[in-house]
């Protein structure tokens, strides 16, 4: 069994997670994730739901009483998430920590919006175009 | 050339974000970038690059003398990034609106994570386990 | 001041066995994965084995796999590295070091190393 | 697994600048942080960088890390070279594409002349 199992069972608790009425409404995360089978489907969706959980945690990180269970879920995230590259995890956590009211990282941002356009598609690394990246613009287009 | 540039363009002069000296202390996103060539970790990083990219649009949705280059860029970034597929556009912005103080939302992410845990790494849908994805602990261990 | 000493090397036979060990003190032990790290004589540095800070995980070489086991006695701040079936490529200095953060990343604390010689 | 090509010896004078590159044979150099270890004849190694291009405390501002996508390798570069900085540096990464563990380059025999 995995190291993060036992410590998740100890945060339900903490939270008062385990009652079946916690699933009304449907799911928040589990829904989602079963919509995307491709990898880097999934990775776009984990991506958001990772960050979730670690701004979760740093909201916690002052309670003494899940710390143990917070610091080993975090470590087999790190382990499964970012296949133990700490690398990986640091550049994620810079783009998580940006601020988007700091002015002078709006204005950064905007400075290379062209070249984070021009590299976000697949597509962009090959030269290929793909059918599908067309502009289509209608009723609900800009959402 | 893409409509995004143009309006791309547009929104550098009202940011002030055409000088030389935005790119003083290094870049946001292009050297993280640079870092990922496997889609899939480009994946993750372009997820919360994007996350960023809309919630400093919504932070200007007001403002009408850029409403048109921001809702030009939206769209582009649908069709390169979401692939024109609003499921996964709309899948995406749930996860992105999730509130991380809502004690409802703070019950069901806990309720859902040994689960949410057990999909994370690409070897949980083979069974297989990475040799690499052992636990280590060190000095900057718990970021 | 934080430390590392290793002992327990020397001469041995090809085939034989040895039990290095690595004394730590200075710092909460626990906390730290650790590592073992060895030097063939005039020969560059090669990564041999690595253990998490609890012991539960363990990590080997290709080169060292079913014949070297690290292990760890938190309750006397030491690392061990049991060596069977010992080859005559196996000589080299062999350092004990700290993992320096999460996983396998860098090396920051090492010992001064042991000898071990494996010959005939 | 990957290997970490370093050049076998370099040498210059006292007060140049040196450059020791170490470059990574499959994936890419940028996807794992890069170390850089000296040691000294008869001594254990010590940090000089870590993760790329970071110093520790105690090491000298003359010594910094640099990582170039484009030639798929690492750099270590000294400054204001001293004779005290005669010895064999050694870059090393985390193999965690093909999950093997730490990569050692072969070392670098840097000679002050």
């Known amino acids: 069994q995995d190291p993060y199992v036992k410590e998740a069972e100890n945060l339900k608790k903490y939270f008062n997670a385990g009652h079946s009425d916690v699933a009304d409404n449907g799911t928040l995360f589990l829904g989602i994730l079963k919509n995307w089978k491709e990898e880097s489907d999934r990775k776009i969706m984990q991506s958001q739901i990772v960050s979730f959980y670690f701004k979760l945690f740093k909201n916690f990180k002052d309670d003494q009483s899940i710390q143990k269970s917070v610091e080993t879920i975090k470590e087999d995230m790190n382990v499964k998430f970012f296949n133990s590259n700490k690398k990986k995890r640091d550049d994620f956590e810079k783009l998580t920590n940006y601020s988007v009211t700091d002015l002078n990282v709006q204005r950064k941002a905007i400075h290379e919006l062209i070249q984070v356009m021009a590299e976000l598609s697949p597509a962009a690394k090959t030269g290929k175009r793909k059918r599908s990246q067309m502009l289509f613009r209608g009723r609900r287009a800009s959402q | 050339q893409d409509p995004y540039v143009k309006e791309a363009e547009n929104l550098k002069k009202y940011f002030n974000a055409g000088h030389s000296d935005v790119a003083d202390n290094g870049t946001l996103f292009l050297g993280i970038l640079k870092n990922w060539k496997e889609e899939s970790d480009r994946k993750i990083m372009q997820s919360q690059i994007v996350s960023f990219y809309f919630k400093l649009f919504k932070n200007f949705k007001d403002d009408q003398s850029i409403q048109k280059s921001v809702e030009t860029i939206k769209e582009d970034m649908n069709v390169k990034f979401f692939n024109s597929n609003k499921k996964k556009r709309d899948d995406f912005e749930k996860l992105t609106n999730y509130s991380v103080t809502d004690l409802n939302v703070q019950r069901k992410a806990i309720h859902e994570l040994i689960q949410v845990m057990a999909e994370l790494s690409p070897a949980a849908k083979t069974g297989k386990r990475k040799r690499s994805q052992m636990l280590f602990r060190g000095r900057r261990a718990s970021q | 001041e934080v430390q590392l000493l290793e002992s327990g090397g020397g001469l041995v036979q090809p085939g034989g066995s040895l039990r290095l060990s690595c004394a730590a003190s200075g710092f909460t032990f626990s906390s730290y994965a650790m590592s073992w790290v060895r030097q063939a004589p005039g020969k560059g540095l090669e990564w041999v084995s690595a253990?998490?800070?609890?012991?539960?995980?363990?990590y080997y070489a290709d080169s060292v796999k079913g014949r070297f086991t690290i292990s760890r006695d938190n309750s006397k701040n030491t690392l061990y590295l049991q060596m069977n079936s010992l080859r005559a490529e196996d000589t080299a200095v062999y350092y004990c070091?700290?993992?320096?953060?999460?996983?396998?990343?860098?090396?920051?604390?090492w010992g001064r190393g042991t000898m071990v010689t494996v010959s005939s | 697994n990957f290997m970490l090509t370093q050049p076998h010896s370099v040498s210059e004078s006292p007060g140049k600048t040196v450059t020791i590159s170490c470059t990574r044979s499959s994936g890419s150099i940028a996807s794992n942080y890069v170390h850089w270890y000296q040691q000294r004849p008869g001594s254990s190694p010590t940090t000089v960088i870590y993760?790329?291009?970071?110093?520790p405390s105690g090491v000298p501002a003359r010594f910094s890390g640099s990582i170039d996508s484009s030639s798929n390798s690492a750099s270590l570069t000294i400054s204001g070279l001293e004779t005290d900085d005669e010895a064999d540096y050694y870059c090393q990464s985390s193999d965690t594409t093909y999950h093997g563990g730490v990569v050692f380059g072969g070392g670098t025999k840097l000679t002050v002349l």
């Open positions: 253990i998490s800070g609890s012991g539960g995980s363990t």
């Open positions: 070091a700290r993992v320096g953060s999460w996983y396998l990343e860098d090396f920051d604390i």
């Open positions: 993760e790329d291009n970071r110093r």
